[in-house]
Structure formats: C-alpha cells, structure tokens
C-alpha cells in the first residue's frame, strides 16, 4: 500500500541546481521517509550528510536540493526509504557528472533471471588511458587504452540476482567524480514468473509495467495505472492512482522517476533520454518512448497516452469493441469513522466498468497490512467488499485506505478510523443494604477506564453457580427485588458507549449474601410509662420452631430528638424490658423483632410518653354548649405529653358553699367531652375543669358560668321526676 516515488531531477549534474524528491503518494507513513547515500552501492562516495527538507508542495514528501556550487560533491548513489510494518521499501538512484568520460545507456536496467545482459556505457571523452569498470565499487574489468571502444560493454550471460548492483565506468586516471553509473536490477524469477518458487504466471503488465516477483502485481510506469497498467493517466500526472502532478511548465520534462525494484528508473510517459528532456517522436509513447502505437483504425497516437481510441473502441491498439471502460470510483465512504474496540466489519463500495472483482478490492490498515475481503457481492452498478477485523484496537486508529485496482484504473480513498476503548468500571458496585429478598446497590459506574460517553449501564447479577441476568439501569442507586433468601450473589456493572459493539467488559465483581427469611415480630406488644425516665415494653412469650437461639432486638428512639436511638438485645425467654435512662415528658418510639442468625421482621412502631415532671397545663378550648333545663355539654382539649391520667369537672350552684360542689372524674384522658345531667332549671352554675397527672392537678385560671334553661310547661300537668 506504499506508493513510494523518487524523482531524480536531474541525474546528470552540470552546474545547475539538482534535486531528489521522495514522495509517499496517497500514503500516510507512521515513520518519516528518509533520503540517504547508498553506501551499499558505492562505498567510497562523499560522506557529507544530506540536507533533507520537507517538500512544501506535497503532504508526504522529502527533498534534497543541491545548489550549483555543490556540484562536485553530488556524484554517487542515493536511496529513499519508507517503512511499513517494520519493513523498509527502498528506492535507489544515482547522480553523475554530465562531463563524465562515459555515460550509461540507461540509469537503470531491469532484466529477468536467466537473461543475457549487456550493460553498456557510451564513450563521450577520448583519453589515452585504460578504461575500468566496477560493480558496487569493486573492480571487475579493465580495457587497455588502445582497445577502449565507443560503447563499453559488460556482458552477463544468464543473469542471476547476485549480478544486480551499480556498475560504473571511468578511465583509470579518473575517480568517483568522473564515473558513470548504471544500476542493474535482476528479477529473482525468470520472465513472466513470480512467487517464492517463481512458478506463478505474472499478469501481463502493459505499457512497460514490470511484474513484481514477490507479489505478482504490476509496477506501472509513471503515467499509467490499473491492475495491468493499461489505463493512461491524464497528461502530466503520475502515481498509482494518477493523483500526483508534475508542476513544471512542460509537465514531467526533466523528471526521472524511480520506483521500487524491480521497476528501477524511467522517464514519465512521453519523454526519453538520460535527462528525460527529449519528447517522444511521433508514433512512440510511454516511458523512455519505448512503446510504439499500432492503432487499428489509424487513430491518433498521443505521446503520453498512446492510441486515442474513438467512441466504442478500447485496448492498447483500439482493437476491442464494446462498452468503454470506466475508472473505478469509491462510493459512500465517510471521511471519519468512530468504532469500538472488538470485531469490526468495514465495507468498501465501488463503481466502475468492468465492475471491480473481489481480488481487486483491498483495505489497507495504517501499519500497511493489506486486508482481502471476507465477503463480496455486487449489483448492476456497484461492487461491495466486506472486510473482517476480528479485533480492532486503539493502535489501529489512523488513516485506512480503501483501494480498488482494475484494468480500468486504480483509485484509493483514505478515511480516518478512531478506535475507542470500551468503558469498564474501575470499582465493583457497592451493596448499600440487603434483605432476604432485595438488595440496594450503588453501581459505582464512575470512575471508569476507557472512552465515554456512557450511553447506558447494565447491572449484571446472579446467584453463584448460575447464569447471569441483567437489568438496564439509569441511576446510580438501584434496588434488586425478588432475590432468593440466604443466597450468595455476584454483581458487576457493564458500561455501554455509543455505536455497534459498544458494550464494555463488565467491571470487577462484588459478592454479597441475602438474609434468611426472618421470624415474625413479638406478639401482644405493649408500651407503657413506668416513671418519668422509664417505659415498660411487654410482649407475649415467644415460641419458635427453629432450633436456633434467638433474642429480641428492641429499638427505641425519641420522637423529638431523632438521634437519640438505642438498640437493646433482650434474651428470648423474657417477655418485657424496662427502657430507662429516658427523659421525662418525652415521647418515644419503640419497635421490636426476633432475631436468630437471620434478622426478623420489625414490629409496627409503638409510641409512649414518659411520665411528666411538672403539673399538667390546664385543658384548653373549654366550651359548654347544648345547655338545656337540666343538661349541659362540656368539651375541652388537652396538650399531649404531660401524662394526663384524668380530667376532673367540678360544678356547683352559684352562691352555695365551696364544699357543696360535685366532682366528675373522667379517667380516660382521651375523652374530650362530657354531658352534665340532673341540673336544676333556671339555675346558674360555676364549672371548673382540671387536668390531673402523676404530679398533681392543673390550676384553673377562672370558672365558667352557665345558666340552665327554664323547665318546659307541663302539658300533662304536674312534674315528673326522672
């Protein structure tokens, strides 16, 4: 997936500025691309470090520019290197003096294993010296001074991979800086073969494309693209998808393009010569003008694209009739995708004609791994490739590339994938309270490890040794109901973030045990005041079927001061407990339960006041109503909390002696009215009401005065005494 291109402009160095530009086209390297001197090829070349700068005109490109005054230091071999998945892809090139004594026929030469090879250098300067030839800086051949031909040749019968290298020629009196260089590239396999054992047939690479011996893919010359290099780019463009453009006024003139081995270096289509500054003559096209147009219907020959076929015709020579080819297009691929760690099934959808096949669609991860589709389908207009990444992880975040390469051309679409870490709580949920059939849980979803936002939460729970169940929860506090008593439970929380597969790994597990089903509360509970500082709680004797020991737990608290709470354990064989050290005139609440190992059920709450330490206040709201000739209705209210045990109503006829009063004592303090009877008609009475408690009676401030009505006329004559 690395489209690395090295532009050598120009390989023959004169006194003009010269440069090397290395472009990682359509590819986003993790590690920087580097340009360096190739000491493997030439050991004794100049040692000066190179001034490598960013090529500002391109996103991923490095450049070395030599000013004219540095011309003498330039001769030698260079490389550009990009790394992907720990593997280096290295492109090599050379620069030599234009005034060298010899010049190579070509900058590089690619041959197949077993080919008969002639490496040739053209003599451009005549000297009375022996000519010498080196391979990678090591001497291989000399030609006596009187025998130096116009074309100096190295003959390599039956070429082998070890023959590959940089061959240089010069006169013996010269040096590296007067040497001419050419690089021989020997494919590991024989012609039209590739694979580890060189037994697989290559795709026929058109337009001088070269079959890569390790992948079987065509490396296309600059200006052509597609699986077979049949598709010509727009003029002055290059790169695997023809996205790069030559910025010169004459397009790619004077640009020598070097691509990964086994391609080597060539001019862009339409140009030839060691400096790539000669246009192709009519009838020729392609890299180094090595291709000839043989247009079937005498179509025009374009030096960049070859035969320009008329409507309805296609092929290199416009020899095929049919639907015109359409460069593939990638459809409906967003620029940015957020995915959750885990299984991921990215989809690449492409149009074009012919429709891309499964083998022609790939997905490239940021580290350069190339994925093949796991599933594939197509409609009339689209091919859809579905890829499978079994476990996508945050390091896989970055620029992924959907790549489609057909005979009609190649297209790549980068898109950004941001892989999120699934959230996982750092802490186990906390059990706030439990009963025999419920538990109150704080799910403790914060803090968590991983990425938010949290879309939802699941509380998983199960009795130990059973399957997990879960409930969807919104709040931090959750009540689990319908639990089994006296059972060990496990709890954990799963957090869910947005998107497919957003369920994180459940967090740490909390264990808890539900209570046993408790005994019922004591029966016949009664709470009565004992003194100013004590209450007495009594109950009926307790009988249980359980063998377990039991006790009565009594809990009491003051109604006025809620904090004053106390729990008392009472042996199970007792039927009462004295609650002492209480405050006088204070209302207390009490409840009780019978506990074994398990806690019992609480009784209803009982309330009582301790006895008063002061006289009671007077009854309030005293009213005397419904007065007749011999009755009157007295009503009142009393204030709670003074241990009022009885109400006394005292009345006497006005003018009578004090000791001639009548007292009515009402011993039920909850009664709040009383009807006086047997009064005399048309008589005035003084009525007093007192409240009585353990200390004494209240003091009435004033007496009420009432007058009975006259007796009704006796219709039947005479009085009747009832």
């Amino acid at each position: 997936a690395m489209d690395l291109i090295l532009i050598n402009s120009l390989p023959l160095v004169s006194d003009a500025e010269t440069s090397l530009t290395c472009i990682a086209s359509g590819w986003h390297p993790h590690e920087p691309i580097t340009i360096g001197r190739d000491f493997e090829a030439l050991m004794n070349q100049h040692q000066d470090p190179l001034e490598v700068t960013q090529d500002v005109t391109r996103e991923w490109a490095k450049k070395v520019v030599w000013k004219r005054e540095k011309a003498s230091k330039i001769n030698g071999a260079y490389f550009c290197e990009g790394r992907v998945r720990g593997q280096a892809i290295r492109i090599r090139t050379m620069k030599m003096r234009q005034q060298a004594s010899f010049l190579p026929a070509t900058l590089t030469m690619t041959v197949d294993r077993g080919d008969n090879v002639n490496i040739s250098f053209k003599k451009v300067l005549i000297k009375e010296e022996d000519a010498v030839i080196y391979k990678n800086g090591s001497f291989i051949h000399s030609v006596p001074r009187h025998e130096v031909p116009d074309i100096l040749e190295v003959h390599l019968p039956h070429a082998q991979p070890q023959d590959a290298g940089v061959y240089s020629a010069r006169y013996i009196g010269g040096n590296l800086f007067t040497s001419a260089f050419t690089r021989l590239i020997v494919r590991r396999c024989e012609a039209q073969k590739w694979g580890p054992d060189c037994n697989r047939p290559c795709t026929t690479c058109k337009n001088n494309g070269v079959c890569h011996e390790d992948t079987g893919e065509c490396i296309c010359p600059p200006g052509f693209m597609g699986r077979t290099c049949e598709k010509a780019c727009e003029p002055h463009t290059f790169g695997r998808t023809c996205k790069e453009r030559c910025s010169g006024s004459e397009g790619c003139k004077s640009y020598v393009f070097c691509l990964p081995d086994p391609y080597g270096c060539s001019c862009a289509t339409g140009w030839r010569g060691l400096q790539c500054n000669e246009a192709c003559p009519y009838g020729h096209y392609g890299p180094d003008c090595k291709l000839r147009c043989h247009c079937t219907n005498e179509e025009m020959c374009d030096r960049f694209q070859g035969c320009l076929c008329s409507q309805g015709w296609q092929g290199l020579q416009c020899e095929k009739e049919g639907r015109p080819r359409m460069t593939p297009q990638i459809e409906d691929l967003p620029d940015h995708i957020e995915v959750n760690s885990g299984k991921f099934n990215p989809i690449c959808k492409a149009s074009g004609w012919p429709l891309p096949t499964s083998e022609e669609m790939t997905l490239v991860k940021p580290d350069g791994t190339v994925l093949q589709p796991n599933d594939f389908n197509h409609t009339d207009h689209f091919s859809v490739a579905i890829f499978t990444v079994n476990r996508i992880l945050p390091p896989d975040s970055g620029v992924w590339v959907c790549s489609v390469n057909t005979v009609a051309g190649m297209v790549e679409k980068p898109f950004n994938i941001s892989v999120k870490v699934l959230p996982e709580p750092l802490h186990a949920p906390n059990v706030i309270d439990t009963g025999h059939n419920f538990a109150i849980i704080n799910i403790s979803s914060e803090p968590y490890f991983g990425d938010g936002p949290i879309k939802s939460k699941k509380l998983f729970y199960k009795p130990v040794n059973q399957a997990w169940k879960y409930i969807q929860v919104m709040n931090e506090i959750v009540t689990l109901n319908y639990l089994e008593p006296r059972t060990d439970y496990e709890l954990c929380v799963q957090l869910v973030r947005p998107g497919e597969g957003g369920e994180g790994h459940p967090g740490p597990v909390r264990r808890f045990t539900t209570a046993s089903i408790g005994l019922p509360p004591p029966r016949g509970l009664s709470l009565l005041p004992k003194s100013q500082t004590a209450l007495n709680l009594t109950w009926q004797p307790i009988f249980t079927s359980s063998e377990d020991e039991f006790y009565v737990e009594v809990e009491r608290w003051s109604q006025q001061t809620r904090s004053d709470q106390q729990n008392i354990k009472v042996p199970g064989n007792l039927t009462s407990v004295l609650l002492n050290n209480l405050l006088p005139r204070e209302q207390y609440s009490v409840r009780a339960r019978v506990n074994t190992k398990a806690q019992g059920e609480w009784s209803e709450e009982l309330r009582a006041w301790t006895l008063s330490d002061i006289l009671p206040p007077q009854p309030e709201n005293i009213k005397i109503t419904n007065i007749t000739d011999y009755t009157a209705l007295v009503s009142w209210t009393i204030v709670d909390g003074y241990s009022i045990s009885s109400i006394i109503i005292r009345y006497k006829v006005q003018g009578k002696n004090e000791d001639q009063h009548i007292d009515v004592k009402i011993k039920n303090a909850t009664i709040t009215q009383y009807q006086l009877k047997g009064l005399e008609p048309e008589t005035t009475y003084h009525v007093d009401i007192f409240a009585e408690n353990n200390i004494g009676s209240s003091n009435p401030a004033f007496s009420q005065e009432i007058r009975t009505l006259p007796a009704p006329k006796d219709l039947g004559g005479g009085k009747m005494l009832l």
Partner: antibody, heavy 119, light 107 residues
C-alpha cells in the same frame, strides 16, 4: 554449497599427456569463469588458464600456450585441462578455482591434484 | 605481464601483534588486487578483493587498502590461526599474476 573437486593428477613422463577434471556444484556453472592455478612444490601460485563455460572463451598463460587446452562441459558442470607435451617444470599441485562472474579473484578453490612429471 | 612484488617474504610475529604486508604492482592496476591466505597442504582462501573489500566470512581483523600500484594487507591483532602464507594477486589484465608470498611465522 559451492564445491570444486579436481581429479586426474598423477605421475607422467616428460612429453606425456594428462587430463585433469574439475567437477563443479552449488552454483550456476555457465555464469562463472573457471580457472586452473598451479603451485610448484615450495613455490608460489601461478595462473594457468581460464574458460567461460557459457560461450567457451579461453585464455592461457604464455608458459602453457599451445600445450594445454582448457574446456568445459556445461551439461556435466565440469571443466577440463588437457595437458600435452608435459615438462618437468609443469610438476605442481593443480587447483581448479572459480572466478565467479568476472575473471578477477578466485573465491572458491578445489583441494588440488598433484601432477608429477618425471622420468 | 604485470609483476606483483610482495614484502617482506617472511616475518615473525607474536599473537596480538599488528602485522602489515605490502604488495607493489609494476603498473597502475586501479584497485584490482586480491589477497589470499594459504596453509600448508591446503588450497588458498580469499580474504580481500578489489583492494579493500572484505570477503564474506573473513574476520574483521583483516583489512586491505591501496590503489594504483601500492597495496597493503593488515592483520590488526594476530591470532594463532593466522600463521600462514599470504599472497597478493592482480586481476587488472590477463594473465592474472600473484606475488611470491609472505610467510607469517610464530616468533
């Protein structure tokens, strides 16, 4: 693994003939040069002849020119040195050596075979 | 033919010593010089080619230098297995020629 194995040495009378063989293995025979180098007892090394098995090109030291013939059979990956009109000064250990791609240095040598020319 | 003259013809040295052997060509041979090691009863072994290139598998204590007519073989720290006879050879023209050899002996 590159191997060169010489054979055919022995005792021969002056004026006699002998044919040495060099069986090669472990490399592309037709893509290399094969040389014969000799070493007289207690003396230094002397190059004798070389051949390019691919095209049959041959070269000889002046001391053996016209008497010795180097040849190669690419089907058998074997080089030969036919020695005629042998002289006492031809007595030496004869080594078969590979020049690899170019007729420069000798990167692999055989174990040598002794040729004694004596009456 | 090009004559190769080696010096010294023999030398005595101890283990750990730095040893230098020189070879002079009768004419400019560029860097077309190789060095070989030979032990008694054995075939020679290539050490250095093209004047300064170390042949694969040869210990790095061996090094070569020179260009034109003067060449040097250096053993930086002599080891017991290095006691042998050393030859230089030019391959600049045919016939290839050897120096007369330098015998390195134990002192």
């Amino acid at each position: 693994e590159v191997q060169l194995v010489e054979s055919g040495g022995g005792l021969v009378q002056p004026g006699g003939s002998l044919r040495l063989s060099c069986a090669a293995s472990g490399f592309t025979f037709s893509g290399s040069w094969i040389s014969w180098v000799r070493q007289a007892p207690g003396k230094g090394l002397e190059w004798v002849a070389r051949i390019n098995p691919y095209d049959g090109n041959t070269y000889y030291a002046d001391s053996v020119k016209g008497r010795f013939t180097i040849s190669a059979d690419t089907s058998k990956n074997t080089a030969y040195l036919q020695m005629n009109s042998l002289r006492a000064e031809d007595t030496a250990v004869y080594y078969c050596a590979r020049n690899n791609r170019f007729p420069t240095w000798f990167d692999y040598w055989g174990q040598g075979t002794l040729v004694t020319v004596s009456s | 033919d090009i004559q190769m003259t080696q010096s010294p013809s023999s030398l005595s040295a101890s283990v750990g010593d730095r040893v230098t052997i020189t070879c002079r060509a009768s004419q400019d041979v560029s860097t077309a010089v190789a060095w070989y090691q030979q032990k008694p009863g054995k075939a020679p072994k290539l050490l250095i080619y093209s004047a300064s290139f170390l042949y694969s598998g040869v210990p790095s204590r061996f090094s070569g230098s020179g260009s034109g007519t003067d060449f040097t073989l250096t053993i930086s720290s002599l080891q017991p297995e290095d006691f042998a006879t050393y030859y230089c050879q030019q391959s600049y023209t045919t016939p290839p020629t050897f120096g007369q050899g330098t015998k390195v002996e134990i002192k």
